[in-house]
């Protein structure tokens, strides 16, 4: 089944054609494409009304459409793999001919949540109801169909063809017939606007006589944005009718001579154009020659005009259109400048915030300020950044180097710090002894206690291994600590001598202990320095590395 009957409506700079025929969306798009168009867009209420008009025209010609609820493809589609997006007016759909998403939509019902299948949109027409401008066709979403299987209730499609401009319809001053042939291969005798490059064939006469004259015209661009047939005077004029037939084909006034001849004229404030038929305002601004937000300003004596642009815009080379001024060329900002339509805005680098003297100035963010420090312990503010540091007994950790992790001194690289038992605590450690031994005053060695339970096989033999003082330890600390007062686990003992005598049992202890209140408050030099943001967004390469690498998402890992 091909595309059969068609209707056409031309308005503004576009023509819409409606076709009946049970085609898939791809076949319908192909049909529009072959003639230089696309399936129609419906980007505004006004455009929806144009499309509705062309559909109404088609339905008047089509005697009996098969379904009460008929659907006509338009150019709104969602490709395979693109998900429904409820946050957007077009829900993740886009117009096949490209172009920007617009806020107008007219969905029939909540859309099916899918990503895998390609989905296409049709206009849903209830043929039992009259088509009213107030009741515009709803958008219905569904599968796009396939050759021979267009989808349920698909009765046709609507194409859209865009043009540089339009010519006015030719005016006949006497009996005759005009046939327009458009660039998209449609023929029509009644168009309210005729697209650029259309041909007009005019056959003058009553139709039943031999004296029929034929004229052929082409809609051309006479000057920029001025489209004209190149004809002069009314067509098919007849002394028999004078001004009585179709106002002599004149746009405004028709003046008859005594011999049956006549001339066209214009009302005050208007002038007759070269075609000797059409009238145009003497005010050159009345034809809205300025584009893109430009305002038309009349010259002296109303003879000519200039276009003026709003602030932040300037005239382009045509002197008719406004283009954005790139204010960032003048470097008005201290750090980053972002050009916006009609203006600009200043932004600050990561680690800075707007402020300081002058427009567009930036000042350092004090990341270490009270209540906003990202560091677990120590924080030092730097220009555009900061770096974290940890207390004695902790090292910097975490992917962004803001956390502090306890150093397990009992398994440190220098070997055990205690002669016998070693208890790691949060931020510190302390030593202990086996049953029957007591801790020496140096807090590291063990000496024989008052009650002997049998000496360990390898008694302590070195005086002082402690590189830092452990926290206060009760004398004769045993190797089997139970739980702390709040039920928190105490430290895990680590023995530095593996061979213990059989009569000196060691019971297992729970894991880790919260840092004792008496932990030393000494600052340790940071192992990661947060590079300043001024040199570009950076982040540490690893937990204990001081190498900064470019972050692939362009954000600063520390901010």
């Amino acid at each position: 089944t091909g595309a059969d009957t068609e209707a056409v409506v031309c308005v503004g700079t576009a023509c819409y054609t409606a076709h009946s025929g049970k085609l898939s969306a791809a076949e319908a798009q192909n049909h529009c494409n072959q003639n230089g168009g696309n399936l129609a867009t419906v980007k505004s209420k006004e455009e929806a009304q144009h499309v509705q008009r062309v559909l109404a025209q088609l339905l008047r010609r089509e005697a009996a459409l098969t379904a009460r609820m008929s659907k006509f493809w338009i150019g709104l589609q969602r490709e395979k793999g693109k998900c429904l997006d409820p946050s957007l007016p077009l829900k993740g759909f886009s117009w096949v001919g490209g172009g920007e998403d617009t806020p107008y939509s007219n969905w029939h019902k909540e859309l099916r949540n899918s990503c895998i299948s390609k989905r296409c949109v049709s206009l849903l027409l209830d043929l039992s109801q009259p088509l009213l401008p107030s009741r515009l066709p709803k958008w219905s979403e569904g599968p796009c169909g396939s050759p021979g299987s267009p989808g349920s209730n698909i009765e046709g499609f609507v194409c859209k063809f865009s043009f540089k401009g339009m010519c006015r319809p030719l005016a006949l001053g006497g009996p005759g017939q005009v046939t327009y042939t458009t660039p998209f291969q449609t023929t029509s005798s009644s168009l309210e606007a005729v697209p650029f490059a259309s041909a007009a064939n005019v056959a003058c006469g009553e139709g039943d006589k031999d004296e029929t004259q034929s004229h052929y015209f082409l809609c051309k661009e006479k000057a920029p944005d001025v489209f004209d047939w190149g004809s002069s005077g009314p067509l098919c004029v007849s002394p028999k009718y004078g001004c009585n037939f179709n106002n002599g084909g004149c746009h405004q006034d028709c003046f008859e001579g005594g011999d049956g001849s006549f001339l066209c004229g214009c009302r005050p404030g208007f002038r007759l154009l070269d075609d000797l038929v059409t009238c145009a305002s003497r005010n050159p601004c009345s034809s809205s020659p300025c584009r893109g937000g430009a305002t038309c300003v009349l010259g002296p004596h109303g003879k000519n005009y200039t276009c003026r642009c709003p602030q932040g815009y300037q005239l382009d080379s045509s002197q008719l259109d406004c283009v954005d001024v790139d204010e960032c060329q003048d470097s008005p900002c201290a750090q980053e400048c972002v050009n916006t339509p009609g203006g600009f805005r200043c932004e600050c680098w990561v680690g800075y915030e707007p402020g300081g003297p002058g427009e567009g100035a930036c000042q350092d963010v004090d990341e270490c300020a009270l209540g906003r420090s990202p560091c677990a312990q120590g924080c030092t503010n730097t220009d555009g950044s900061f770096h974290c540091s940890c207390e004695e007994g902790y090292v910097l950790a975490g992917e962004d180097g803001t956390q502090c992790q306890d150093v397990d001194e009992c398994v440190g690289p220098g070997g055990p710090l205690c002669d016998s038992l070693c208890f790691n605590t949060q931020g510190s450690f302390h030593c202990g002894c086996l049953p029957g031994w007591v801790l020496a005053p140096n807090g590291v060695s063990c000496t024989m206690g008052p009650v002997s339970l049998g000496p360990p096989s390898g008694p302590p033999d070195e005086e002082d291994k402690g590189e830092k003082e452990g926290s206060t330890v009760p004398r004769a600390a045993t190797a089997s600590p139970t739980r702390g007062p709040e039920g928190t686990p105490k430290a895990t003992p680590t023995t530095s001598r593996p061979s213990l005598s059989s009569d000196a049992p060691i019971t297992s202890a729970p894991l880790k202990m919260l840092a004792p209140s008496g932990s030393p408050g000494v600052w340790r030099e940071p192992s990661i320095h947060h590079a300043t943001a001024a040199s570009g967004p950076q982040e540490p390469a690893g937990g204990d590395s001081s190498v900064a690498t470019q972050n692939n998402d362009g954000t600063d890992g520390q901010k």
């Epitope: 998900c83 997006d85 990503c115 390609k118």
Partner: antibody, heavy 120, light 108 residues
């Protein structure tokens, strides 16, 4: 409420095929896509592919093309995944899942999983 | 394909602690298409956070999610024993959908 009921555990020989089923209830079957996910201790969760029951359209992870075939039966509201030429690498738990109430591929419904063991 | 890297692979925390796990993508992901799942041993995964920061039905308010571009994170403000599980991130930026390797959270 939405439920996805998967077939029971399977022990299959190397080189054989197996067809797993996922029966949906509590919603209109053709309204939601159905996806399949493989889980192993080594590779964790891997998306195999999905099917749109309304149209029969499918999308596959290239790593599983030729290994898995997804189908759906509207009349019984069930989705199927056939795995062929099985090897020990295919031993895994397979889940059917869909995103009924949410958008952007946030899988809010999961079956209980089917354990497939490939062993001679 | 867009590879998701989760870190750390395993983490342990005491009840009441604040924990953060991260998910990095090899290429940018729209925040709408980044989700987190919780899976407990022997159970199916459960959607936990969707579209970066929205909590799924029934998820406690102590959980939160944030991020954009290639870097995302899940945070638990005050860990509870019931939070012990493996957490997976998942993204979609074109087929195939991919999951992270998971972060196993153990409670001390």
């Amino acid at each position: 409420q939405v439920q996805l009921q998967q077939s029971g555990a399977d022990l299959v020989r190397p080189g054989a095929s197996v067809k797993l089923s996922c029966k949906a209830s509590g919603y209109t079957f053709t309204d939601y896509e159905m996806h399949w996910v493989k889980q192993t201790p080594v590779y964790g969760l891997e998306w195999i592919g999905g099917i749109d029951p309304e149209t029969g359209d499918t999308a596959y992870n290239q790593n599983f093309k030729g290994k898995a075939t997804l189908t759906a039966d509207k009349s019984s509201s069930a989705a199927y995944m056939e795995l062929r030429s099985l090897t020990s690498e295919d031993s895994a738990v397979y889940y059917c899942t869909n995103y009924g109430n949410l958008y952007y591929y946030a899988m809010d419904y999961w079956g209980q999983g089917t354990s497939v063991t490939v062993s001679s | 394909e867009n590879v998701l890297t989760q870190s750390p692979a395993i983490m342990s925390a005491s009840p009441g602690e604040k924990v953060t796990m991260t998910c990095r993508a090899s290429s940018s992901v729209s925040s709408s298409y980044l989700h987190w799942y919780q899976q407990k041993s022997g159970a199916s995964p459960k959607l936990w956070i969707y579209s970066t920061s929205n909590l799924a039905f029934g998820v406690p308010a102590r959980f939160s999610g944030s991020g954009s571009g290639t870097s995302y994170s899940l945070t638990i403000s005050s860990v509870e024993a019931e939070d012990a599980a493996t957490y997976y991130c998942q993204q979609y930026s074109g087929y195939p959908l991919t999951f992270g390797s998971g972060t196993k959270l153990e409670i001390k």
